[in-house]
């Protein structure tokens, strides 16, 4: 909370309200929607960001082929239930008592059911594949320059440890960024790959979550990298459980 600066704002989360009534009269920033105090020296969890958002006055061979168990977030926005640490609760329900299980990035991983549905544990998303298509440029980007720039971005802007950026693939105009982070690899204080991916997604859409910073200006050797399409695939440590009806649809 001390990272909230003297002017009492939260550099890493504009979806907060900050006031000088924290311990010792210091600036304290609370997430909209949940009222939870957030640590402004790091990324805010995706669950709290989604909750704030809902409450705010408001294919080539060299590329990775997502596995059959990969999830895409097709359900869109919802007002999630977050646990005491700001993470997604394993079971989410809407106002009409329809419930479903989610993974650690809040994406549905079961069919929808009723209040009797059980979600025994929050299943970790350990592999995220960010699939981007950039706008036409005079020529292809240099792969190693592109790789270095995206790794720098995740390290410096999102504070994600470089070891969690597993690979950057490129075959013009498609870029794929692979993030991997097993439960055993994630130490206290490490940014979660799900949170980093969400901040990146919002940046790419021109909806930066950072306070007062300009939007994302991605350049490779001075050449602007403008993204025209984004798809994100989520792979869980335990495969999702959907009925055959959905799988054959």
């Amino acid at each position: 909370h001390t990272a909230a600066q003297d002017n009492c704002t939260c550099p890493t989360n504009k979806m907060t309200v900050c006031s000088p009534d924290g311990p010792g009269g210091r600036c304290q920033c609370r997430a909209l929607g949940s009222g939870m105090a957030v640590d402004c020296s790091t990324l805010t969890s995706k669950c709290l960001l989604l909750k704030a958002r809902m409450s705010a006055p408001k294919n080539a061979r060299t590329l990775v082929r997502p596995s059959e168990h990969a999830l895409v977030d097709n359900d869109g926005l919802y007002d999630p239930d977050c646990d005491p640490e700001g993470r997604f609760k394993a079971r989410q329900c809407n106002q009409t008592s329809v419930c479903w299980c989610v993974n650690s990035v809040g994406v549905r991983r079961t069919d929808k059911g009723d209040l009797s549905l059980r979600c025994d544990e929050l299943v970790r998303t350990h592999h995220i594949l960010i699939d981007l298509r950039h706008r036409p440029t005079a020529g292809a980007f240099n792969h190693s320059d592109l790789d270095a720039e995206l790794r720098r971005l995740f390290r410096e802007r999102y504070r994600l440890h470089p070891k969690f950026v597993a690979a950057v693939h490129y075959e013009q105009p498609t870029i794929q960024i692979e993030l991997r982070q097993n439960t055993s690899q994630k130490a206290a204080g490490d940014v979660d790959i799900g949170d980093a991916a969400y901040y990146f997604e919002r940046d790419i859409k021109g909806e930066s979550l950072f306070q007062g910073r300009g939007g994302l200006d991605l350049r490779v050797r001075g050449e602007p990298l403008q993204v025209e399409r984004t798809l994100i695939y989520y792979l869980d440590e335990i495969p999702p459980k959907f009925s055959m009806k959905r799988l054959t649809a």
């Epitope: 309200v17 006031s19 105090a37």
Partner: antibody, heavy 116, light 111 residues
Amino acid sequence: QVQLVQSGAEVKKPGASVKVSCKASGYTFTNYWIGWVKQAPGQGLEWIGDIYPGGGYTNYNEKFKGRATLTADTSASTAYMELSSLRSEDTAVYYCARGTGGGDYWGQGTLVTVSS
Amino acid sequence: DIVLTQSPDSLAVSLGERATINCRASQSVSTSSYSYMHWYQQKPGQPPKLLIKYASNLESGVPDRFSGSGSGTDFTLTISSLQAEDVAVYYCQHSWEIPYTFGGGTKLEIK
């Protein structure tokens, strides 16, 4: 010095609405949350919700959502709590406080009596 | 919602003796840095008065016989040497998440 001064006692009929005001002075009104708390006769404290006058952001206790409305007039440094569809169990003293958890300054309280 | 359970409901202590009031939360209200628990004193016909903020920070103007401790789910308000003017009802409140609930109160009397 910091002061919160609330409006006077009210007597209302069931089904009516009441609007309690809380005038702040001695600090920058837009920088702090204003919380509202209910205390029924002989009972404990119950958190209703809060408002951040600097942006009009509000939070509500689900129990009061839909019936309580929190607003603020920054030009008058005054916060308001309106409670609608009054019933007998709304008879209570209502307090405003600066800050939410750990409210460091409180109004004197406004007694609202709901009686037919 | 986080439920705060205060104990005891009422307490009688002799003047000059130590008084201890407990507050247990239904889930942790602490991070590694801070505990989001606060203590108030309320005398009849008066608004609550903040004594302790963030579990252990004494509010300005509050006598140093009052102290707060605890983290996680268990918190304690201690009055080291009870004075006559300390007769009141004491409440804990968390500010971890919405709604910021209060404990049921502890009535402190002189034995």
